[in-house]
Interface confidence: medium
């Protein structure tokens, strides 16, 4: 690598993957082994992000960009650039303190991450139950009753509710 | 990159209503919920309520219940917070977030200011 | 109605352990998680579910949770933690609720 030779900053000429080591008169130095450096000018290199435990790795670091991880299966991920790894549970049921629960009553999850959600309410929409809701599936409305031929019947949710202590995530 | 984009700073009169966005990007936006937060000058974080982008269910801290509303558009991945009766204690940056029962991504916040 | 009560104040020199608690009738049942929050800054997550850190935070931050009271640790405390830390929590009908909040001073 040769030495910089702009006037300004010596340091601006060294490109990603490089740093410039004070050390060594601001010679643009390679980044030493898992570490990176994704923009021109460093003067250090970052440390590559290392997926271990429940993390795996996505893509594996290179002198200019960092490693990327994703979760083992069983796992989805959280968080920005998945910084977090957190259990799967199946549909019909919410992930709590004391592990995976079953949906209450008037609840549904359809994905195997996320919290048990509140059935639609039809009748907010002047709408009627066409199909009742179940740990898995929401509602689906039909017409409003009064859309409804005579002697059809409708069936419609009691309020949701949540035992006590059904925690979120 | 997952982002959330907020609307820039407002100055309101006491009464009136303000209407803030947050867009969405770089994730499923039905995926999770929509909360917003607001933190007064020199105070702490204050929960306002959240949106569910599937069917725009939608759930308030009582503090705010009746003068808050958070809406949803799936089409463009943004979420809205409008709040009525404006007073001077309203004054606080409003941050809208990411997640369920806890927030794993904050947008930059927006400044609302409130005076006569 | 879910309340989390912090002390207002903790105050420690560099390289000390500093221990910020939390507590509130509901933790033993549901999830503690903890903000860093520095002046002009969104929150952070340092810590989720009481105890897991997600990546890219450092090491010396963990959670401990025990019967109605949650604590977040900061052990080895730099001039960087300086900063609000804040509990939170939510109750069984997705309420969310912050603590008041514990401005962590570093001597």
């Known amino acids: 690598f040769e030495r910089t030779r702009s006037l300004q900053d010596p340091c601006s000429n060294c490109p990603a993957g490089t740093f410039c080591d004070n050390n060594r008169n601001q010679i643009c130095s390679p980044c030493p082994p898992n570490s990176f450096s994704s923009a021109g000018g460093q003067r250090t290199c970052d440390i590559c992000r290392q997926c271990k435990g429940v993390f795996r790795t996505r893509k594996e670091c290179s002198s200019t960009s960092n490693a990327e991880c994703d979760c083992t299966p069983g796992f989805h991920c959280l968080g920005a650039g998945c910084s977090m790894c957190e259990q799967d549970c199946k549909q019909g049921q919410e992930l709590t303190k004391k592990g995976c629960k079953d949906c209450c009553f008037g609840t549904f999850n359809d994905q195997k991450r996320g919290i048990c959600r509140p059935w639609t309410n039809c009748s907010l929409d002047g709408k009627s139950v066409l199909v009742n809701g179940t740990k898995e599936r929401d509602v689906v409305c039909g017409p409003s009753p009064a859309d409804l031929s005579p002697g059809a019947s409708s069936v419609t949710p009691p309020a949701p509710a949540r035992e006590p202590g059904h925690s979120p995530q | 990159q997952m982002q959330l984009v907020q609307s820039g700073a407002e100055v309101k009169k006491p009464g009136a209503s303000v209407k803030v966005s947050c867009k969405a990007s770089?994730?499923?936006?039905?995926?999770?919920?929509l909360h917003w937060v607001r933190q007064a000058p020199g105070q702490g974080l204050e929960w306002m309520g959240m949106?569910?982008?599937?069917?725009?269910?939608?759930n308030y801290s009582q503090t705010f219940q009746g003068r808050v509303t958070v809406t949803r558009d799936t089409a463009t991945s943004t979420a809205y917070m409008e709040l009525n009766s404006l007073r001077s204690e309203d004054t606080a940056v409003y941050f809208c977030?990411?997640?369920?029962?806890?927030?794993?991504?904050w947008g930059q916040g927006t400044l609302v200011t409130v005076s006569s | 109605l879910l309340v989390l009560t912090q002390s207002p104040s903790v105050s420690v020199s560099p390289g000390q352990t500093a221990r910020i608690t939390c507590s509130g009738d509901?933790?033993?049942?549901?999830?503690a998680y903890w903000y860093q929050q520095k002046p002009g800054q969104a929150p952070v997550l340092v810590i989720y579910?009481?105890?897991e850190r997600p990546s890219g935070i450092p090491e010396r931050f963990s959670g401990s949770s025990s019967g109605t009271t949650v604590t977040l640790t900061i052990s080895g405390v730099q001039a960087a933690d300086e900063a609000d830390y804040y509990c939170q929590s939510a109750d069984s009908s997705d309420i969310v609720v912050f603590g008041g909040g514990t401005q962590l001073t570093v001597l």
């Open positions: 770089g994730y499923t936006f039905t995926n999770y919920y």
């Open positions: 977030a990411r997640g369920f029962g806890f927030i794993d991504h």
């Open positions: 949106v569910n982008p599937i069917g725009g269910y939608t």
């Open positions: 509901a933790l033993p049942k549901q999830y």
């Open positions: 579910k009481d105890s």
